[in-house]
């Protein structure tokens, strides 16, 4: 089931999926002056069996016959209402994502790929937030959002991250920033999805690792 909306926007923060749930689609977008090959796929799809997940279809771009300067926009499958754009940088993997069943890792870039990636997320997808450069977390509660199905509608949980450009004024010096901690929250507050040990390790790493883990910047 596709998520109706994009993950929540948080002021001065970006989000990143550490892995993509099966069913996630990534549009095949090409940079200016290039287009999808005629027989090429509209999108890549994360699919898999019980032991292995991977991206079906390959995106391929070819030089446009008419090199106009307008941005190429890939047609959307009809049922998709929303799209999320991500700016491509180096495809470094922060954590071994292959260890998470039912999820695909970040697809490698393809030749002449557009600078933005447009994903269509599915129910159960989790994304992680951090403050952009020049800002810090004034408060970091659970800094993730999960796409959930409630009463037949999809919604994303609200991440509890507040970023500020001000200098630190902590009342308790030396106290570490908290980890995102799904366990221990009442049901109404819980991101009640994906709770494998591997993913919790990723969650903890996402909360503590340096900016470099967010190699794909979300617009």
């Amino acid at each position: 089931e596709l998520c109706d909306d994009d993950p929540p926007e948080i002021p001065h923060a970006t989000f990143k999926a550490m892995a993509y749930k099966e069913g996630t689609m990534l549009n095949c977008e090409c940079k200016r002056g290039f287009r999808r090959i005629k027989s090429g796929s509209l999108y890549m799809l994360c699919t898999g069996n019980s032991s292995h997940s991977s991206w079906d279809n390959q995106c391929q771009c070819t030089s446009s016959a008419t090199r106009n300067t307008t941005k190429q926009v890939t047609p959307q499958p009809e049922e998709q209402k929303e799209r999320k754009t991500t700016e491509m940088q180096s495809p470094m993997q922060p954590v071994d994502q292959a260890s998470l069943p039912g999820h695909c890792r970040e697809p490698p870039p393809w030749e002449n790929e557009a600078t933005e990636r447009i994903y269509h997320f599915v129910v159960g997808q989790m994304v992680y937030y951090q403050c952009v450069q020049g800002y810090r977390a004034l408060h970091r509660g659970p800094a993730e959002s999960v796409c959930k199905m409630t009463h037949g509608k999809t919604r994303w949980t609200q991440p509890q991250l507040i970023c500020t450009g001000e200098m630190e004024t902590s009342q308790f010096p030396g106290e570490e920033k908290p980890q995102a901690s799904p366990e221990g929250r009442p049901e109404s507050e819980t991101s009640c999805l994906v709770t494998t040990t591997d993913f919790q390790i990723q969650t903890e790493m996402a909360a503590t690792m340096e900016t470099s883990i967010f190699t794909t910047e979300y617009q």
């Epitope: 004034l138 509660g141 991250l161 507040i162 004024t169 902590s170 908290p178 929250r185």
Partner: antibody
């Protein structure tokens, strides 16, 4: 269910200080930051500031720097706001609210400053 | 500081009708605006955040739209329980700022 329970009404003399409280329950207290908001006839709602319930980090509206001091006690899941050197202009209802989008609010604490 | 101008300051409407409130900001706030309903003797209630995202449990009669510096909030098919004061809040950067409020009354 999520609740923010605030302390009762206060009637105080000008020049003194007062400390009001906001106790969170029904959720993991340290997951959510807490905000304080002033409601007065003159200025409707005014955002006073925010405190991290996790580490006590704060950010104030410049208008309330030196007037309000926010603190938090994790052990009792309670946030406090002290208002100093009170004048009649501080008479108002003060609310606490939680989180990155103020999704739950306390019932308000009425402060009356009168000689 | 970013200024928030909410209008109108008061509004009289008929039950079953539609009302629209607006908030204008002095700078682009990138859709980081929320709307709250406030009734006497209670704490305010979050209705919409990030311009148009309805808070769970809020009826779909409520809606929000806008971008840049101009935002609006609408209530369709006005019901008696909608009578309240409504506030916008910009939260794109600290310190956050509320609009002046709109008192909604029934004609």
């Amino acid at each position: 269910q999520v609740q923010l329970q605030q302390s009762g009404p206060e009637v105080v003399r000008p020049g003194v200080s007062v400390k009001i409280s906001c106790k969170g329950s029904g959720y993991t207290f340290t997951d959510y930051a807490l905000h304080w908001v002033k409601q007065s006839h003159a200025k409707s709602l005014e955002w006073i500031g925010i405190i991290s319930s996790y580490n006590g980090d704060t950010s104030y509206n410049p208008r309330f720097k030196g007037k309000a001091t926010m603190t938090v006690d994790k052990s009792s899941s309670t946030a406090y706001m002290e208002l100093a050197r009170l004048t009649s202009e501080d008479s108002a209802i003060y609310y606490c609210a939680r989180g990155s989008n103020l999704d739950y609010w306390g019932q308000g604490t009425t402060l009356t400053v009168s000689s | 500081d970013i200024q928030m101008t909410q209008s109108p300051s008061s509004l009289s409407a008929s039950l079953g009708g539609k009302v629209t409130l607006t908030c204008k900001t002095s700078q682009d706030i990138n859709k980081f605006i929320a709307w709250y309903q406030h009734k006497p003797g209670e704490g305010p209630r979050l209705i919409i955040h990030y311009t148009s995202t309805l808070q769970p449990g809020i009826p779909s009669r409520f809606s929000g739209s806008g971008s840049g510096k101009d935002y609006s909030f609408s209530i369709n098919n006005l019901e008696p329980e909608d009578i309240a004061t409504y506030y916008c809040l910009r939260y794109d950067d600290l310190p956050w700022t509320f609009g002046g409020g709109t008192k909604l009354e029934v004609r």
